[in-house]
């Protein structure tokens, strides 16, 4: 099969913190030296950027200093976390894998993972 | 909203070169893969070529490699195909399109023609 | 290269009725990867399906895509004056992207 499969969670639960990790496993048809992993969001219909980065295969995985991701990658899966996330973030976010070097370019989109946020319940006040 | 404007095309020599453009608005060029999509007059529409996000790569159809270039300008938000060594079998109306997030061309442009001809 | 046939190559039917296009790959090519475009004459093509079942924005719910392995289907269940044009399928999984020669649904 020409495809690639990339496999995410299909539920993730952020932190009280507003952060949500979860894993980006691809199956590469090629052998790929240079990996685009994009996140989106898909909301009403609607899809959009959340963050995306190129990596060499073997280097670390860097976004830019004001992206609101993280992610360190292992041969063929790319830990993601994603910060600051408030319960309007709540939402599918899907990875997205892109073979772009050596030819041929190989598409993979995950299924999506829904992620849960809930926003903390501010401290009540105390007499200490 | 996003909206894709093509400009460049005529009528060419054979062997000849021409430039095409693209002006892209209501989005941000480099979040995006960008490519030509060419068509035949009363015939199906043909993939060219596509450029993705920081410009360091660029694929090509087998029938336009070596002869015809794709590159962008992120400040101008312009897309373009430099088309060298033209020959017969380029006459068609070429099209710019935006790679969609999810995958597909999303957007279009509306066309230029481009006829090669002695 | 992925080669992609379309069937049939013109399709007869009248407003109101459904029409089922088919794309079929030469080789196996995941669904998840395959768009079809509506063509009218004179107007670039727009897309109408991605992702083999998802509707573009501003696509009506009278269009509908499925399909597993080498075959997808593009239906339109009940077709209005403005679905008659050409209707073309592209796989974009891999490159080079490639697309179908095209369908034309006319009025019978």
């Known amino acids: 099969c020409k495809a690639m499969h990339v496999a995410q969670p299909a539920v993730v639960l952020a932190s009280s913190r507003g952060i949500a990790s979860f894993v980006c496993e691809y199956a590469s048809p090629g052998k790929a030296t240079e990996v685009r992993v994009t996140v989106l969001r898909q909301a009403d219909s609607q899809v959009t950027e959340v963050c995306a980065a190129t990596y060499m295969m073997g280097n670390e995985l860097t976004f830019l200093d004001d992206s609101i991701c993280t992610g360190t990658s292992s041969g063929n899966q790319v830990n993601l976390t994603i910060q600051g996330l408030r319960a309007m973030d709540t939402g599918l976010y899907i990875c997205k894998v892109e073979l772009m070097y050596p030819p041929p370019y190989y598409l993979g989109i995950g299924n999506g993972t829904q992620i849960y946020v809930i926003d903390p319940e501010p401290c009540p006040d105390s007499d200490f | 909203q996003v909206q894709l404007v093509e400009s460049g095309g005529g009528v060419v020599q054979p062997g000849r070169s021409l430039r095409l453009s693209c002006t892209a608005s209501g989005f941000t060029f480099s979040s995006y893969g960008m490519d030509w999509v060419r068509q035949a007059p009363g015939k199906g529409l043909e993939w060219v070529a596509v450029i993705w996000y920081d410009g360091r790569n660029k694929y090509y159809a087998d029938s336009v490699k070596g002869r015809f270039t794709i590159s962008g300008d992120s400040s101008k938000n312009t897309l373009y195909l430099q088309m060298n060594s033209l020959r017969a079998e380029d006459t068609a109306v070429y099209y710019c399109?935006?790679?969609?997030?999810?995958?597909?061309?999303?957007?279009w442009g509306q066309g230029t023609l481009v006829t090669v001809s002695s | 290269e992925i080669v992609l046939t379309q069937s049939p190559g013109t399709l007869s039917l009248s407003p109101g009725e459904r029409a089922t296009l088919s794309c079929r790959a030469s080789?196996?090519?995941?669904?998840?990867?395959l768009a079809w475009y509506q063509q009218k004459p004179g107007q670039a093509p727009r897309l109408l399906i991605y992702?083999?079942?998802s509707r573009a924005t501003g696509i009506p719910d009278r269009f509908s895509g499925s399909g597993s392995g080498t075959d997808c289907t593009l239906a339109i269940s009940r077709l209005e004056p403005e679905d008659f044009a050409v209707y073309y399928c592209?796989?974009?999984?891999?490159?080079?992207?490639?697309f179908g020669q095209g369908t034309k649904v006319e009025i019978k």
């Open positions: 399109a935006r790679g969609g997030l999810l995958g597909g061309f999303d957007y």
């Open positions: 080789q196996s090519v995941s669904s998840s990867y």
């Open positions: 992702g083999a079942s």
């Open positions: 592209q796989q974009y999984g891999s490159s080079p992207w490639t």
